[in-house]
Interface confidence: low
Amino acid sequence: HTAAQDNCTCPTNKMTVCSPDGPGGRCQCRALGSGMAVDCSTLTSKCLLLKARMSAPKNARTLVRPSEHALVDNDGLYDPDCDPEGRFKARQCNQTSVCWCVNSVGVRRTDKGDLSLRCDELVRTHHILIDLRHRPTAGAFNHSDLDAELRRLFRERYRLHPKFVAAVHYEQPTIQIELRQNTSQKAAGDVDIGDAAYYFERDIKGESLFQGRGGLDLRVRGEPLQVERTLIYYLDEIPPKFSMKRLT
C-alpha cells in the first residue's frame, strides 16, 4: 500500500502532503519542498527529507575506532539538490555559487569550490558507525539483549535487512552500531543504510519522522535506553579528498 487509505497520510514520512489523486483515487503523497511522490511503505530518502526540512518553518575497547577517512557531518543542514530518484546529486551548491561534492548520505567529502568544481560520481557511503552514549542506569545492559533489541529496531522500525547491521559493540556507557552495505549488496527494494541511520538519528533526538507514531521508546528487557549523545561517522567506498590545510 502506497499510503494509509483511510485518512490518506504517509505512515513513514510526516513531512508530506497527501491527497487521493493517485490512480483509481488512491492516496498519493508528495514530499514537502521537492513535490516528489514518495513510497509510503518504506523510508523516504535522506535527500528528500533534508529538502523538506529546509522548506518547513524554521521553528518547527572492543569499540571501533573510526578510520582516518571517516566523515562527520560538521556542515549541518543545507537545502540539497536531489536527483529524480531522490538521491543526493554528487555536486551541491549554495545560493552564493559555492559548490562541493557529497557522498550518498549527503555529507561533504571535498573542499568547497566554485561552479567549476566537478564531482564525477556519487560516491557510496558503505560503512556507517553510530556512536551512542546512554544515560546512567542501575547497571550495564546485557550485551546480547542490547544487540538483539537494536538489530530488531533497525529491522522493524526502519525496515533495514538484518544482514546490513554488521555489529553492535558495547562498553558501558558507549554503544556502537555498525551498518555496512556495499553497492553490490544493495538489492532493489532494500532500505539504504544512510536513510536508516538518518531516521534513527532523528528518532534519538526526539524528532521522529514517522506519521502519528509515538516517539522512539527503546527498551532492553524493559529497561529504558536513553541516549544522551550521538556521533555518526561515515566511511565512503572511495576516501574523501580534502586539502592538507583542512586536515591540519
Epitope: 546485557n142 546480547s144 544487540d147 538483539a148 538489530r151 530488531r152 522493524e156 522500525r157 547491521v165
Partner: antibody, heavy 123, light 107 residues
Framework: AVTLDESGGGLQTPGGALSLVCKGS????????MGWVRQAPGKGLEYVAA???????GYGAAVKGRATISKDTGQSTVRLQLNNLRAEDTATYYC?????????????????WGHGTEVIVSS | ALALTQPSSVSANPGETVEITCSGG????????YGWYQQKAPGSAPVTVI????KRPSNIPSRFSGSTSGSTNTLTITGVQADDEAIYFC???????FGAGTTLTVL
C-alpha cells in the same frame, strides 16, 4: 545443504527432566538464531524456545520457568532442557533454524526444520 | 498470547490460484512479520515455504509467494498442483505463535 538432526527423545516420566540436542550443519551456525517448536499428537505447532546468535533467549508460555535453551557454537549444537515434565509435554519436538541471527523472537523467520524427535511423557 | 486467524480449509482445482490469509500477529515498531510452513501429514517435518513475509527458501518453487497488507499476510499459490495438498501453518514474529493451520485440498 542445511541439515538439522535432533536427538534425546523417547519415553519420559512425569516430573522428570528432558534434554534434547540438535546438531546443525551446512551453514555458519554462529550466525543464526536457533530454536525448538513442538507438535502434540493431532494438534498444531507450538513455539517452545529460541536462542539468538548473540545468545539472547526466548521461551513459550507453556514452558517458561521449566525450560532452558543453550548452545555450543563450537559443536554447532543447540540444547533444550525441560524440567518438571507433564503429560502435555508429549509431542514431536522439531529443531528449527532462523533465516536471521539477531533475535530470539523468531517464529516468522524459520527457514529450515529438522525431522523431529518424539517425546512421550507417561508413567 | 495473540491468536493468529487463518481459514480452517481452502480448496482449489489444479492450475488455479489459491490464497490463504493470516492475521492477528503482534506489531512491533509498527510492522508485522509472518512465515508459512507446509506439513504434508501430521507428525511429518514441516517445510518452510515463505518466511519473513515474502522470502522463499531456494528449494521452494516460485509459484509460492507471500505478501503483506497492514496486519494481514497472504500466502498465494499460483497454479496449484496436487503435490501442494497439505496443512499450511502461519507463524507470527512478535507473538511467537502459530495459527491453527489451513488444510488445502486440491480437487
Amino acid at each position: 545443504a542445511v541439515t538439522l538432526d535432533e536427538s534425546g527423545g523417547g519415553l519420559q516420566t512425569p516430573g522428570g527432566a528432558l534434554s534434547l540436542v540438535c546438531k546443525g550443519s551446512g551453514f555458519t551456525f554462529s550466525s543464526y538464531a536457533m530454536g525448538w517448536v513442538r507438535q502434540a499428537p493431532g494438534k498444531g505447532l507450538e513455539y517452545v524456545a529460541a536462542i539468538s546468535s548473540g545468545s539472547s533467549t526466548g521461551y513459550g508460555a507453556a514452558v517458561k520457568g521449566r525450560a532452558t535453551i543453550s548452545k555450543d557454537t563450537g559443536q554447532s549444537t543447540v540444547r533444550l532442557q525441560l524440567n518438571n515434565l507433564r503429560a502435555e509435554d508429549t509431542a514431536t519436538y522439531y529443531c528449527a533454524k532462523s533465516g536471521y541471527g539477531g533475535s530470539a523472537s523468531y517464529v516468522s523467520d524459520i527457514d529450515a526444520w529438522g525431522h523431529g524427535t518424539e517425546v512421550i511423557v507417561s508413567s | 498470547a495473540l491468536a493468529l486467524t487463518q481459514p480452517s480449509s481452502v480448496s482449489a482445482n489444479p492450475g488455479e490460484t489459491v490464497e490463504i490469509t493470516c492475521s492477528g500477529g503482534g506489531d512491533y515498531y509498527g510492522t508485522y512479520y509472518y512465515g508459512w510452513y507446509q506439513q504434508k501429514a501430521p507428525g511429518s517435518a514441516p517445510v518452510t515455504v515463505i518466511y519473513d513475509n515474502t522470502k522463499r527458501p531456494s528449494n521452494i518453487p516460485s509459484r509460492f509467494s507471500g505478501s503483506t497488507s497492514g496486519s494481514t499476510n497472504t500466502l498465494t499459490i499460483t497454479g496449484v498442483q496436487a503435490d501442494d495438498e497439505a496443512i499450511y501453518f502461519c507463524g507470527s514474529y512478535k507473538s511467537n505463535t502459530f495459527g491453527a493451520g489451513t488444510t488445502l485440498t486440491v480437487l
